[in-house]
């Protein structure tokens, strides 16, 4: 069985302030089981943007229906983009673990740049 890959097809995305940004991510396998998370930035200081397991992320919607048992699309849309949202976003697959899930594989990242709102 081929090992799971995390595919973020776009290296960069440019969005006008006030619009929504779609960040694409797909998995090549459902195994190992475990949640998907999105982060802005890398390393210890990265910011959690979305956690499939839990939490309230009012500006984030998933593009696909994550409750489908065969879902491999973990793309997200972030609404009302501001310049503060600029950065590189990583789609990260975790495998289940106890007490904490273990980071398994990360996408290559998508850099979000924010254009000034058209006047």
């Amino acid at each position: 069985e081929d090992e799971l890959q995390v595919i973020q097809p776009e290296k960069s995305v440019s969005v006008a302030a006030g619009e929504s940004a779609t960040l694409r991510c797909a998995m090549t396998s459902l195994i190992p089981v475990g949640p998907i998370m999105w982060f802005r930035g890398a390393g210890a200081g990265r910011e959690l943007i979305y956690n499939q397991k839990e939490g309230h992320f009012p500006r984030v919607t998933t593009v696909s229906e994550l409750t489908k048992r065969n879902n491999l699309d973990f793309s997200i849309s972030i609404s009302n983009i501001t310049p503060a949202d600029a950065g590189t976003y990583y789609c990260v697959k975790f495998r289940k673990g106890s007490p904490d899930d273990v980071e398994f594989k990360s996408g290559a990242g998508t850099e979000l740049s924010v254009r000034a709102k058209p006047s």
């Epitope: 459902l30 195994i31 089981v33 397991k53």
Partner: antibody, heavy 118, light 107 residues
Framework: DVQLVDSGGGVVRPGESLRLSCAAS????????MSWVRQAPGKGLEWLAG????????YYIDSVKGRFTISRDNSKNSLYLQMNSLTAEDTAVYYC???????????WGLGTLVTVSS | ALTQPASVSANPGETVKITCSGG??????YGWYQQKSPGSAPVTVI????KRPSDIPSRFSGSASGSAATLTITGVRVEDEAVYFC???????????FGAGTTLTVL
């Protein structure tokens, strides 16, 4: 509080049909996948079918495929199980259950009894 | 198929462990469901291997390792007498399965 109320059970003859309902309250029904699980008298739990939050994807155990249909109406906060060609082996208490993000169950209905007898 | 013992017994205050085997660790999540009488609604005491719902007492805990899951009740009480079913979701087959149930008797 999360509440799931099963209904629609009763006594039917072999070969007949029945439609079970599950009324949900206390949570955003349209955000959760749901399942039906049954328990025959003196037996264990048996998962029958699951449905995604939007209702587009359904999943069944082999023994009920083609006979049972799971569906939902998110505008009515309701889950359904249409059961056709019933046999005595379908006699059981039927529970609806809310799924967790990874398709286990966190809340259960009270159950509704289906008896198939001639 | 999930395999669990048919019965276990313990004195009040003792620690009880119920095991459930039969799933592949990397494709399976486990849950534990308490049923106090036949035909009554099950209550989820553990889901996602080790997650305890907020209304379940802290004496209930869960773990998974290799091809097995374990439900541990630390300081068992008389009111914990019930049948405990392990359940699993398999990410390869998209199917839920249950063990046959373990009857816990508190002496």
């Amino acid at each position: 509080d999360v509440q799931l109320v099963d209904s629609g059970g009763g006594v039917v003859r072999p070969g007949e049909s029945l439609r079970l309902s599950c009324a949900a309250s206390g949570f955003t029904f349209s955000s959760y996948a749901m399942s039906w699980v049954r328990q025959a008298p003196g037996k264990g739990l048996e998962w029958l079918a699951g449905i995604s939050a939007g209702g587009s994807d359904t999943y069944y155990i082999d023994s009920v495929k083609g006979r049972f249909t799971i569906s939902r109406d998110n505008s009515k906060n309701s889950l359904y199980l249409q059961m056709n060609s019933l046999t005595a082996e379908d006699t059981a208490v039927y529970y609806c259950a809310r799924e967790t993000w990874n398709h286990l169950f966190d809340y259960w209905g009270l159950g509704t009894l289906v008896t198939v007898s001639s | 198929a999930l395999t669990q013992p048919a019965s276990v017994s313990a004195n009040p205050g003792e620690t009880v462990k119920i095991t459930c085997s039969g799933g592949d660790y990397y494709s399976t999540y486990y849950g534990w469901y308490q049923q106090k009488s036949p035909g009554s609604a099950p209550v989820t005491v553990i889901h996602s291997d080790d997650k305890r719902p907020s209304d379940i007492p802290s004496r209930f805990s869960g773990s998974a390792s290799g091809s097995a899951a374990t439900l541990t009740i630390t300081g068992v009480r008389v009111e914990d007498e019930a049948v405990y079913f392990c359940g699993a979701y398999d990410g390869r087959t998209y199917i839920n399965t249950f063990g046959a149930g373990t009857t816990l008797t508190v002496l």
